[in-house]
């Protein structure tokens, strides 16, 4: 007789990440009677939505519904019918809706409350949208990449089943790059974490973790690009800014409303006598690398270390997998490479910075200006966070690894996100039952 | 279970104002919305607007000139406003707790009728 | 406004018998469609969301069909309590708009 294959019973999940620049959805999938063990849930689907962050949709929220649709309806296609009811949806928005809500709590409730309505409108048990704290999103990045390289789990083996993992239990560090902010989570060794609010105590599968994490908000390389112009405009002569982070040759008019606008440079605000300015790109990686680090305060520190800005920083500990746009940066500017030492990677930024926008343009043909036109800032901005912010030095920038995914689910804290409002991340480690791995029938 | 209760006049004088109160149970207004539909003979069942579970509103270009939907999320009760009533406002109104914009639970109705 | 055209103002059945109300759409609606059972004097009562998932509670003979901008409510193997009228109504866009109903009669 002919071996029928048993109906598989398996679960799945959908989180929306709203980030500030955009909104990506995540479907992920895990067996049913293994919810518990680790490493179980996996990405089965990313779809990016077409637009920017739910935060620009202040003045236009009728337009939510359908910016949602195809990333929604997409799921409906990947996920079966007869689960669609089933599957949980959550929505976690990050920075950009943190700093809408310091803006107007009211114009933030009236996002989240139109984005509510339309996700409701589909056949999925939808769970609820909420701005995640700044804590959560670095925990639970923390918690994905953790999970995925297998370091929760007990069992030692004697072969590797993910590439970075060094075979021990020794959790990896995440730091984590948004639009808005930044995040950088990691467990100190054996060192008091002074500051009580950058504290976070876990138990899972049966271990304690003492965990130190810090939400840097207006540091997400967007944010920190336009903080760094609001600084640089104040002592411009004129209305043409020169400016090092950008290609020799590259010109963009910047309006004054538009770099006021967000809260993150109210403090460089100033009555400019013009409403545009234009950036001149000068292209020098020095130069800029020096005006990125007029954005860190490092005058001021309560603690026995920080890292910026009068916030606690233990000393760094064990490797750390940097994602998000840590990882799609350097992926670009092709220094993700564990190989590539950080005088190397500062190197190759100089001669990248250093290039014509014309040359820029040609070579990368097919890539958004917009996008393109930042990448010297950004992959500068990178390097100044992490050597200067977050005190990584030549010798321990070898322990950063640039992640993009970790056996096919992103790195980010949409996983974790899930995995803890599902309860599949348990505090004592499950009991091993027989026939756990194949079940013979 | 789920319960909407709704209470308000039967009677309303021309160009008079309607209130009325929809008191729910069995969930919160914090997880749910609440929509309003009036259903007469002549117009079938009409979408009035809606009340979302952050406060915020949507209206019936319609009405949106002399309707008001606010709440008390503490007292898990909608309150619904409508100005200048005339003799064509004269239906039964609806309250409906709702996730999105299927009306997933009725009120039992509240019988309006517009007379002097 | 998008208009809901339910065409059979009233429609005729038998116990057992399996029917079929339909309703259609003035523009693409997706599948943004509910449908709801009116009995007399009672409230409308949700059975159908997402033109096609039913609401937990509702009988198996009660399927929804249809995408864009046709969209049928089936009854198979109707029974004597399934005698009431029937709505749908469209949530693709504002203002939300209801089908005008069809009664349904048992012979």
């Known amino acids: 007789t002919q071996n029928k294959a048993l109906p598989e019973n398996v679960k799945y999940g959908i989180v929306l990440d709203a980030g500030s620049s955009h909104t990506s959805l995540y479907i992920y999938k895990w067996p049913a009677e293994k919810e518990n063990d680790t490493g179980v849930v996996h990405q089965v689907e990313e779809c990016r939505v077409k637009g920017p962050g739910i935060s620009k949709f202040v003045q236009k929220v009728n337009e939510i519904g359908i910016y949602l649709t195809d990333c929604m309806e997409r799921a409906r296609e990947v996920i079966p019918r007869s689960q669609h009811q089933e599957t949980p949806v959550y929505l976690g928005a990050t920075a950009g809706m943190r700093l809408l809500r310091m803006e107007s709590e009211e114009l933030a409730d009236r996002v989240l409350d139109v984005v509510e309505r339309s996700l409701s409108n589909y056949p999925f048990d939808f769970q609820g949208a909420r701005i995640i704290t700044g804590q959560e999103e670095g925990a639970y990045g923390w918690i994905t990449i953790n999970y995925l390289l297998g370091k929760f789990s007990q069992k030692t083996r004697w072969f590797s089943i993910v590439p970075y993992e060094t075979n021990n239990q020794e959790t990896f560090g995440a730091l984590d790059l948004g639009g808005a902010s930044t995040q950088v989570t990691f467990v100190p060794q054996n060192q008091t974490i002074e500051s009580p609010d950058n504290a976070l105590q876990f138990r899972l599968y049966g271990k304690d973790y003492n965990v130190y994490t810090h939400s840097f908000l207006c540091y997400g390389k967007d944010q920190a690009l336009w903080q760094k112009l609001a600084k640089d405009i104040q002592v411009a002569s004129n209305e043409i800014l020169r400016d090092p982070c950008f290609h020799p040759g590259y010109k963009k008019v910047v309006n004054v409303s538009d770099l006021y606008k967000t809260p993150c440079t109210k403090r460089f605000e100033m009555t400019l006598p013009f409403q545009q300015f234009e950036i001149q790109g000068i292209g020098n990686y020095q130069q800029c690398h020096q005006s990125i680090l007029e954005l860190f305060n490092t005058s001021y520190c309560p603690y026995s270390q920080c890292a910026f800005n009068g916030i606690f920083l233990p000393p760094l500990q064990g490797d750390f997998g940097a994602f998000s746009a840590f990882y799609f940066v350097m992926k670009f500017l092709n220094l993700t490479s564990e190989k590539v030492s950080q005088e190397k990677v500062t190197e190759m930024m100089k001669k990248f910075c250093a290039q014509p926008w014309e040359e820029i343009k040609t070579s990368y043909a097919g890539v958004k200006e917009k996008y393109l036109s930042e990448y010297c800032f950004s992959g500068t901005y990178i390097l100044s966070l992490l050597l200067q912010g977050y005190h990584f030095t030549a010798d321990s920038w070898e322990h950063i690894h640039f992640i993009g995914k970790i056996q096919g689910s992103d790195a980010g804290w949409t996983l974790g996100y899930m995995l803890n409002l599902t309860n599949m991340i348990p505090a004592e480690q499950p009991l091993s039952t027989p026939l756990s791995h194949s079940t013979y029938v | 279970q789920v319960q909407l209760k709704q209470s308000g006049p039967g009677l309303v004088q021309p160009s008079q104002s309607l209130s009325i109160t929809c008191t729910v149970s069995g969930f919160s207004l914090t997880s749910y919305g609440v929509h309003w539909v009036r259903q007469s003979p002549g117009k079938g069942l009409e979408w009035l607007g809606v009340i979302w579970r952050r406060g915020s509103t949507d209206y019936n270009a319609a009405f949106m000139s002399r309707l008001s939907i606010t709440k008390d999320t503490s007292k898990s009760q909608v309150f619904f406003k409508m100005n200048s009533l005339q003799t064509d406002d004269t239906a039964i109104y609806y309250c409906a707790g709702v996730r999105g914009d299927a009306m997933d639970y009725w009120g039992q109705g509240t019988s309006v009728t517009v007379s002097s | 406004d998008i208009v809901m055209t339910q065409s059979h103002k009233s429609m005729s059945t038998s116990v057992g018998d399996r029917v079929s109300v339909t309703c259609k759409a003035s523009?693409?609606?997706?599948?943004?469609v509910a449908w709801y059972q009116q009995k007399p004097g009672q409230s409308p009562k949700a059975l159908i969301y997402s033109a096609s998932y039913r609401y937990s509670g509702v009988p198996d003979r009660f399927t929804g069909s249809g995408s864009g901008t046709d969209f049928t409510l089936t009854i198979s193997n109707v029974q004597s309590e399934d005698l009431a009228e029937y709505f749908c109504?469209?949530?693709?866009?504002?203002?939300?708009?209801f089908g005008g109903g069809t009664k349904l009669e048992i012979k």
């Open positions: 523009q693409n609606v997706g599948t943004n």
């Open positions: 109504q469209q949530y693709n866009s504002y203002p939300l708009t």
